[in-house]
C-alpha cells in the first residue's frame, strides 16, 4: 500500500541495505524510491541530541514483509519508498540547501555570480552530481563566490556538514534542464575500452543503455551481445566513464555494441521501463516466488504487482498440464538486473513495469497509427485538445497539446480578444467536434500564460500555456506528448505530422473529425527564401511540401506538429502562421518548441 507521509521521531529497526547522505528526509525518500531494493528508510535530521556524524544519514532498508518494527527516536524521520505508489515520480530536486556543505570529489572550482549560476554550471557539466557555493558573506575572502562542482560514485554526497554562508544543491539534469548533447546512436561492432564503473547483465543493448542512463556515474557503455565469442561475457553490460566525458578508446570488435548515457534527454525517453519480452531467455536471480500463470503477459503483471519483484522468467506449460498454466518465477537481485542470462531453455523473461512511473508519462507507447487517409482515429493523437471559447457562442477556437497533467501548450495568437480564462474550455480525448454536447466534461482554464515577448505570430514568440483548473487523468485517449530535449537540437526529424480540426482549404469551415497530414520539415534557410518579407528566426521551424497541397490552416493554430523519434512522439512545433494554406512554395511556420523548453519548465515548475 502507498504511504506518502513521513513519520517524525520514528526509526525503523533492522533491514539495512546501505547508508547514504541526503540533505533532507524528502530527498532520502526519493533516493530510496530509485534504489532497486529499498522499500523503507530512516533519515536522521540535525539535532542537538544526535551525534553530528549521524546528521543527514539516510539508511535505506528492505523487508520481506514490506514493513519493519518502529522505535521512537528523536530527530529520526522514517517513511516508505514511492515504489508502492501509483503516482508519477521524479528525481528532479531544485531545492537549495542553506548552510550545508555536501561533500564529494571537488573536481572543478570557479567563480560564479550566484548559486543559480553555479547550479546551471553543474547541470551543464557531464560529471557534476551536486555543488556547493560559497556566498559573498563567506568568512574566507579567497573562497567567496566560489562554485565547487562535485561528483561521487553514488551521485549522493559522501558526507554533509553544517557550514555557515554556503549553499548546496543538485544538478538539474533530471529536471530536463541540461544543455548537454544527447547522442542516441548505438554503435555496432564497437568496444569503448575506457574505465568501467560497474558491470551488469542485460538482455540487449537498449536495456544496457537505459541502465547506464540512470546510473549516476555512467557516461557511456559497451554491451556484449549473446553472439559474443566469450561465453562468460555474453549479455554483459559495461558501464563506463572517462575524464573528458567521451570515450577515448574505440576498438572495432564484432558482436559488441556501444553507446552513450541519455541523461540529458531522459525526460523524453523511457529509462526505467523495460517493457519488452525476451523469448527463449532465462533471467537468473534470487527467487521471490513461483506462481502459476496463463501467459508471459500475466506473469509480468504478477511481477509488477509484487513490490519486491524486479524481473521474471515464465516457462510455458507443457501440453495439458496444470490447466494450461505455466510457471512464473518472480525474481530480484541486489542491483535490479539478472545475475546471469541464459538462452535456449525455452523461458520468456522480462522486467517489472512498476518502475515505468519513474519515466515521463509522455514516453508511453500509443496504439499503432492508421497509415494513409486524412481522418484520424480515436486515440491516435491523445495529446491533441480542442480549445473552445464560449463567447459570444461556443465554438472551436484553437488546437493545443497536453504536456503535463495540468498544462496545455498552444499558440499565443489564439488569445487575441480573449479577456478572461473563464470563457475557455479545454476538451481532451475528442475525435469528432460533434461529440461535444452541453453535458460533455471539459477542463476549465485557471490561467493563460502568454510569452511576454509575443507581439504577433509572424514576429515569433507565438507560444502560450494554459493552466487547467483540475488535473487530467491520463488514459489511452488523453495523455501528454514529450517536449523535445535541448540536447536533441541537432536531431533530424523525418516522421512529422500536423493535426487539427481546421479548414481544409482557405475558405472553408471547421472540420468535424480530427484531420492529420504527414509533412516534411524544411530548413530555416529554405523557409527564409519563401518568406522574403519576414524574418524566419531559429525560434521558428517550417514544414511543408514544395508543391503545397498539405498544410495546417485556420483553426489548426496552437495545435501540435508532432514528430516521432526513437518510438517516442515529440512536440516539435506549435502551429503558428503561413501565407495562405498549402500554397506552393509557402511552408507552414511553427513555433520551434525546443527553443522554449526553459520557458515552459520555468512556468510549469514554478512553486
Amino acid at each position: 500500500e502507498c504511504v506518502t507521509q513521513l513519520l517524525k521521531d520514528t526509526c525503523f529497526e533492522g533491514g539495512d541495505i546501505t547508508t547514504v547522505f541526503t540533505p533532507s528526509a524528502k530527498y532520502c525518500q526519493v533516493v530510496c524510491t530509485y534504489h532497486p531494493r529499498c522499500l523503507l528508510f530512516t533519515f536522521t535530521a540535525e539535532s542537538p541530541s544526535e551525534d553530528p556524524t549521524r546528521w543527514f544519514t539516510c539508511v535505506l532498508k528492505d523487508s520481506v514483509t514490506e514493513t519493519l518494527p518502529r522505535v521512537n527516536r528523536t530527530a529520526a524521520i522514517s517513511g516508505y519508498s514511492f515504489k508502492q505508489c501509483s503516482h508519477q515520480i521524479s528525481a528532479c530536486n531544485k531545492d537549495i540547501y542553506v548552510d550545508l556543505d555536501m561533500k564529494g570529489i571537488n573536481y572543478n572550482s570557479s567563480v560564479a555570480k550566484s548559486a543559480q549560476e553555479c547550479q546551471e554550471r553543474c547541470t551543464d557539466d557531464v560529471h557534476c552530481h551536486f555543488f556547493t557555493y560559497a556566498t559573498r558573506q563567506f568568512p574566507s575572502l579567497e573562497h567567496r563566490n566560489i562554485c565547487l562542482l562535485k561528483h561521487t560514485q553514488t551521485g549522493t554526497p559522501t558526507r554533509i556538514t553544517k557550514l555557515d554562508k554556503v549553499v548546496s544543491g543538485f544538478s538539474l539534469k533530471s529536471c530536463a534542464l541540461s544543455n548537454l548533447a544527447c547522442i542516441r546512436d548505438i554503435f555496432p561492432n564497437t568496444v569503448f575500452a575506457d574505465s568501467n564503473i560497474d558491470s551488469v547483465m542485460a538482455p540487449d543493448a537498449f536495456v544496457c543503455g537505459r541502465i547506464c542512463t540512470h546510473h549516476p556515474g555512467c557516461l557511456f557503455f559497451t554491451f556484449f551481445s549473446q553472439e559474443w565469442p566469450k561465453e562468460s561475457q555474453r549479455n554483459l553490460c559495461l558501464l563506463k566513464t572517462s575524464e573528458s566525458g567521451l570515450p577515448s578508446t574505440r576498438i572495432k570488435k564484432s558482436k559488441a555494441l556501444s553507446g552513450f548515457s541519455l541523461q540529458s534527454c531522459r525526460h523524453s525517453i523511457p529509462v526505467f521501463c523495460h517493457s519488452s519480452f525476451y523469448h527463449d531467455t532465462d533471467f537468473l536471480g534470487e527467487e521471490l516466488d513461483i506462481v502459476a500463470a496463463k501467459s508471459h503477459e500475466a506473469c509480468q503483471k504478477l511481477c509488477t504487482n509484487a513490490v519486491r519483484c524486479q524481473f521474471f522468467t515464465y516457462t510455458p506449460a507443457q501440453a495439458s498440464c496444470n490447466e494450461g498454466k505455466g510457471k512464473c518465477y518472480l525474481k530480484l537481485s541486489s542491483n535490479g538486473s539478472p545475475t546471469k542470462i541464459l538462452h535456449g531453455r525455452g523461458g520468456i523473461s522480462g522486467y517489472t513495469l512498476r518502475l515505468c512511473k519513474m519515466d515521463n508519462e509522455c514516453t508511453t507507447k500509443i496504439k499503432p497509427r492508421i497509415v494513409g487517409g486524412t481522418a484520424s482515429v480515436r486515440g491516435e493523437w491523445p495529446w491533441q485538445v480542442t480549445l473552445h471559447t464560449t463567447s459570444p457562442t461556443q465554438r472551436h477556437l484553437c488546437g493545443g497539446s497536453i504536456i503535463g497533467n495540468q498544462w496545455i501548450l498552444t499558440a499565443a495568437h489564439c488569445f487575441y480578444g480573449v479577456e478572461s480564462p473563464k470563457i475557455l474550455r479545454v476538451y481532451s480525448g475528442i475525435l469528432n467536434q460533434s461529440e461535444i454536447k452541453e453535458d460533455t466534461s471539459f477542463f476549465g482554464v485557471q490561467e493563460i500564460i502568454i510569452h511576454d515577448q509575443y507581439k504577433m505570430a509572424e514576429s515569433g514568440y507565438d507560444i502560450a500555456l494554459l493552466k487547467l483548473e483540475t488535473t487530467v487523468n491520463y488514459t489511452d485517449s488523453q495523455r501528454p506528448i514529450c517536449l523535445p530535449s535541448k540536447g536533441d537540437r541537432n536531431v533530424i526529424y523525418t516522421d512529422c505530422w500536423v493535426t487539427g480540426w481546421g479548414y481544409r482549404k482557405l475558405r472553408d469551415k471547421i472540420q468535424n473529425t480530427l484531420q492529420k497530414a504527414k509533412i516534411p520539415l524544411v530548413t530555416n534557410e529554405e523557409c527564409q527564401k519563401r518568406y522574403r518579407g519576414h524574418k524566419i528566426t531559429h525560434k521558428m521551424i517550417c514544414a511543408g511540401y514544395r508543391e503545397g497541397g498539405k498544410d495546417a490552416c485556420k483553426g489548426d493554430s496552437g495545435g501540435p506538429l508532432s514528430c516521432k523519434h526513437n518510438e517516442v512522439w515529440h512536440l516539435v512545433g506549435i502551429t503558428s502562421w503561413g501565407e495562405g494554406c498549402a500554397q506552393r512554395e509557402r511552408p507552414g511556420v511553427y513555433t520551434n518548441v525546443v527553443e522554449y523548453v526553459d520557458w515552459i519548465l520555468e512556468k510549469t515548475q514554478a512553486v
Epitope: 569503448f192 574505465s195 568501467n196 564503473i197 566469450k230 562468460s232 576498438i251 570488435k253
Partner: nanobody, 126 residues
Framework: QVQLVESGGGSVQAGGSLRLSCTAS????????MAWYRQAPGNECELVST???????YYADSVKGRFTISRDNSKNTLYLQMNSLKPEDTAVYYC????????????????????WGQGTLVTVSS
C-alpha cells in the same frame, strides 16, 4: 585457474628499449583479446595497447610509433616491444585478457571473464 605472468620489466635509460612478455595458462589464449595496461604511481590505470583475437591492434596516442604489440598463439604468449622509452613511461605494466577497460581506475579488479596479471615494473630514468 587462469594465470597471466608478465616478465621483461626493469630499469632502462631514456631512449632505450625493453620487451615485455606475458605467458598465459588455463584458458584458450587464441580466442582471447589481449591487452597491456599500465599504472604509474598516483595515476589511474590506462590502456596502452590491445590486440584482438583476429589480430587487430590499438595503441594509446602516447605510445603510437614507439610500442608494438604482438602475440604468438602457439606459445600462449603476448608481447610488448617498447622503443624510444621516456621517463613518463615509468609504471607497472599489466597484461590483461578479455578486459575492456580498467575498473575504477585500478589495474587489478575485473568483471566476469576478464583477467589480469600481477604486473611488472618498468623504470625509465633520464
Amino acid at each position: 585457474q587462469v594465470q597471466l605472468v608478465e616478465s621483461g620489466g626493469g630499469s632502462v635509460q631514456a631512449g632505450g628499449s625493453l620487451r615485455l612478455s606475458c605467458t598465459a595458462s588455463e584458458f584458450t589464449f587464441d580466442d582471447s583479446d589481449m591487452a597491456w595496461y599500465r599504472q604509474a604511481p598516483g595515476n589511474e590505470c590506462e590502456l596502452v595497447s590491445t590486440i584482438t583475437s583476429d589480430g587487430g591492434t590499438y595503441y594509446a596516442d602516447s605510445v603510437k610509433g614507439r610500442f608494438t604489440i604482438s602475440r604468438d598463439n602457439s606459445k600462449n604468449t603476448l608481447y610488448l616491444q617498447m622503443n624510444s622509452l621516456k621517463p613518463e613511461d615509468t609504471a607497472v605494466y599489466y597484461c590483461a585478457a578479455d578486459q575492456w577497460g580498467s575498473a575504477e581506475g585500478d589495474c587489478t579488479s575485473s568483471y566476469p571473464g576478464g583477467y589480469w596479471g600481477q604486473g611488472t615494473l618498468v623504470t625509465v630514468s633520464s
